[in-house]
Amino acid sequence: EVEKTACPSGKKAREIDESLIFYKKWELEACVDAALLATQMDRVNAIPFTYEQLDVLKHKLDELYPQGYPESVIQHLGYLFLKMSPEDIRKWNVTSLETLKALLEVNKGHEMSPQVATLIDRFVKGRGQLDKDTLDTLTAFYPGYLCSLSPEELSSVPPSSIWAVRPQDLDTCDPRQLDVLYPKARLAFQNMNGSEYFVKIQSFLGGAPTEDLKALSQQNVSMDLATFMKLRTDAVLPLTVAEVQKLLGPHVEGLKAEERHRPVRDWILRQRQDDLDTLGLGLQGGIPNGYLVLDLSMQEALS
């Protein structure tokens, strides 16, 4: 806390300018009017105030707006935003995408801080859903943003927003998240033709069910092994050797290198060795000839 002292004669600030950087903390407290500061916040960023001086400026704004800053002030906080705590930010009502962008810019190139996470949370809750423009902005600043959301939060993403998602935005998503995103992507891209559709849907396929993989296998998509390895194991297991061969096209040769890893390993165990041999890749571990395969899951469903 800065002691309350009278402003020395001739030092009362008429505007926020460079002369203030030579003021001591107590002079800033005494000589800068909080309302003047609020109306000229845009100037603060251009003035190289010290860390301690910024404490005083924040204190003045906190006193002026105990219930939370108005958006007109928030939009021009600039690097003073880095002084805010999550508790401060929870008092704000940020509705403008321009305000959000201005504050994210200050944190650009750094991982998401608790302040930024709180800001985004307030903004998205205020909007009611993650619309395309917001998602565009957030993934531009934080490529991993989408994968930081819970499946419940992702359910509020409208299919139209999926167009803003780039493959790298999904790199850290787990299967539960892709389970939510895949149906939205399928809906968003449904009017595209085969090859274009596959390019767009490819990053989301970790959430695809068996029937969709079977359908893709009929479209000469030539899925690469990296994508195949990210598919849900339970979706891959029912695929036949012929379907996997069609799905992967020329990439089918890559199965050999992945035969010890999921989902390839588990898929091999479900195939007849005879069928695997038709691939000519030397894949081993299939069901030997003459063995009967009982689908116990089907038996349980019937009883």
């Epitope: 460079e18 190289p48 010290t50 860390y51 910024l54 690097y79 880095l82 002084k83 200050v106 944190n107 650009k108 190139g109 750094h110």
Partner: nanobody, 118 residues
Framework: QVQLVESGGGLVQAGGSLRLSCAAS????????YGWYRQAPGKQRDLVAI???????NYADSVKGRFAISKDNVNNTVYLQMNSLTSEDTGVYYC????????????WGQGTQVTVSS
């Protein structure tokens, strides 16, 4: 690890000149501003001169027209040219830099002593 190392201080006669240097190392972020502070014996540390990333300079009233701050962006070095020195200029001079992107942080050097004898 950011390090600021000052040099160029010493004993000088009133009316004389000195040039302080501050070599900055370990900087992996855009610097918002560099500055020089002076701490006279028994007093608080006061800002003397500051230069922003764009090259804008500002000076305390007591040194205007006598001191000049400059920076060499290639070598990450900041200078303070001090002319017409008086006994009032005696003190420890600290180099300082501001980080304002990603985090708010001020970095300081260890200081260099300047003594002006009359």
């Amino acid at each position: 690890q950011v390090q600021l190392v000052e040099s160029g201080g010493g004993l000088v006669q009133a009316g004389g000149s000195l040039r302080l240097s501050c070599a900055a190392s370990g900087i992996t972020f855009p610097v918002n501003a560099y500055g020089w502070y002076r701490q006279a014996p028994g007093k608080q540390r006061d800002l003397v001169a500051i230069i922003s990333a764009g090259g804008t300079t500002n000076y305390a009233d007591s040194v205007k027209g006598r001191f000049a701050i400059s920076k060499d962006n290639v070598n990450n070095t900041v200078y303070l040219q001090m002319n017409s020195l008086t006994s009032e200029d005696t003190g420890v001079y600290y180099c300082y830099l501001q980080r304002r992107i990603g985090m708010l942080r001020d970095y300081w050097g260890q200081g260099t002593q300047v003594t002006v004898s009359s």
